[in-house]
Interface confidence: medium
């Protein structure tokens, strides 16, 4: 059982781990999951040009400033 | 900019109760997890339980089943924690927080509330 | 429950020196452990999530480091206003558990 399996237990996530160091520009399209009734934490799944799809750490760089806008309506905090 | 306005200082007697709010700003509320937690002096921090704002979830510790009952009004962006038949013992700062991008951290605090119980 | 064993309870330090408190969970709790920094008669505040990661507005004098069950918080080149009182929390399973805390006092 990886990391979210003690924490989310009672929950059902999509995403049981991330994919680290992919290029923006390898995404076709992104899709953001908010906590809800099915999982705790926020997800991010990324459809890659090639047609794979993986999840992504919303903490990553270049992604973060983009969640925020999209989770609060433009606040700049977390 | 996140904020968590909680509820001034409350005198209560024993076997009464009381409810705690927390008023969430900055933030789309049902966004996000609301935790408790309870600090008294000499004892730490305790966590008492949490909410997903959205609705439909809450979770408490085994301390407190029975004990805390949290609840939110999401038109307001408030939080609230009701705490039954109190005692000596629940005396203490209650604090709410928001969660980070999941359960597992608090990122914003409350100032806190003062419960103190006495005859 | 998860125990969480947090040491030193309390420690003094100088100006400029490296601080390092350290938290050890009763099991592995793959890295859900924050640290929160707490003044007198203030609510806490949020420094490391994630075992490394510093949260927004965090001095980067600020450090996180461990996994499995051992952890530390790292103060590299202490300052006046880093007096207080430092927490860890885990949350790699249900209930979250703080240390008992650790109260940094300057020499």
């Known amino acids: 059982a990886g990391p979210a399996a003690a924490v989310l237990r009672e929950l059902r996530c999509v995403c049981l781990q991330t994919t680290q160091g992919v290029h923006p520009k390898m995404i076709s399209n992104l899709q953001v999951f908010a906590i809800g009734p099915q999982c705790s934490k926020v997800e991010v799944v990324a459809s890659l040009k090639n047609g794979k799809e993986i999840c992504l750490d919303p903490e990553a760089p270049f992604l973060k400033k983009v969640i925020q806008k999209i989770l609060d309506g433009g606040n700049k905090e977390n | 900019q996140v904020q968590l306005q909680q509820s001034g200082a409350e005198l209560v007697r024993p076997g009464t109760s009381v409810t705690i709010s927390c008023k969430a700003s900055?933030?789309?509320?049902?966004?996000?997890?609301i935790v408790w937690v309870k600090q008294r002096p000499g004892h730490g921090l305790e966590w008492i339980g949490d909410?997903?704002?959205?609705?439909?979830?809450?979770f408490y510790s085994e301390n407190f089943k029975g004990k805390a009952t949290l609840t939110a009004d999401t038109s307001s962006s408030t939080a609230y924690m009701h705490l039954i038949s109190l005692t000596s013992e629940d005396s203490a700062v209650y604090f709410c927080?928001?969660?980070?991008?999941?359960?597992?951290?608090?990122?914003?605090w409350g100032q806190g509330s003062l419960v103190t119980v006495s005859a | 429950d998860i125990k969480m064993t947090q040491s030193p309870s309390s420690m003094s330090a100088s100006l400029g020196e490296r601080v390092t408190i350290t938290c050890q969970a009763s099991?592995?709790?793959?890295?859900?452990l924050s640290w929160y920094q707490q003044k007198p008669w203030k609510s806490p505040k949020t420094l490391i999530y994630?075992?490394?990661r510093l949260a927004d507005g965090v001095p980067s004098r600020f450090s996180g480091s461990g996994s499995g069950q051992d952890y530390s918080l790292t103060i590299s080149s202490l300052e006046s206003d880093d007096t207080a009182t430092y927490y860890c929390?885990?949350?790699?399973?249900?209930?979250?558990?703080f240390g008992a805390g650790t109260k940094l006092e300057l020499k």
């Open positions: 927080a928001r969660s980070g991008y999941d359960r597992t951290w608090f990122a914003h």
């Open positions: 900055g933030y789309t509320f049902t966004n996000y997890w």
């Open positions: 909410l997903y704002s959205g609705g439909g979830y809450t």
């Open positions: 099991q592995d709790i793959e890295s859900y």
């Open positions: 994630y075992a490394t």
């Open positions: 929390l885990q949350h790699g399973e249900s209930p979250p558990t």
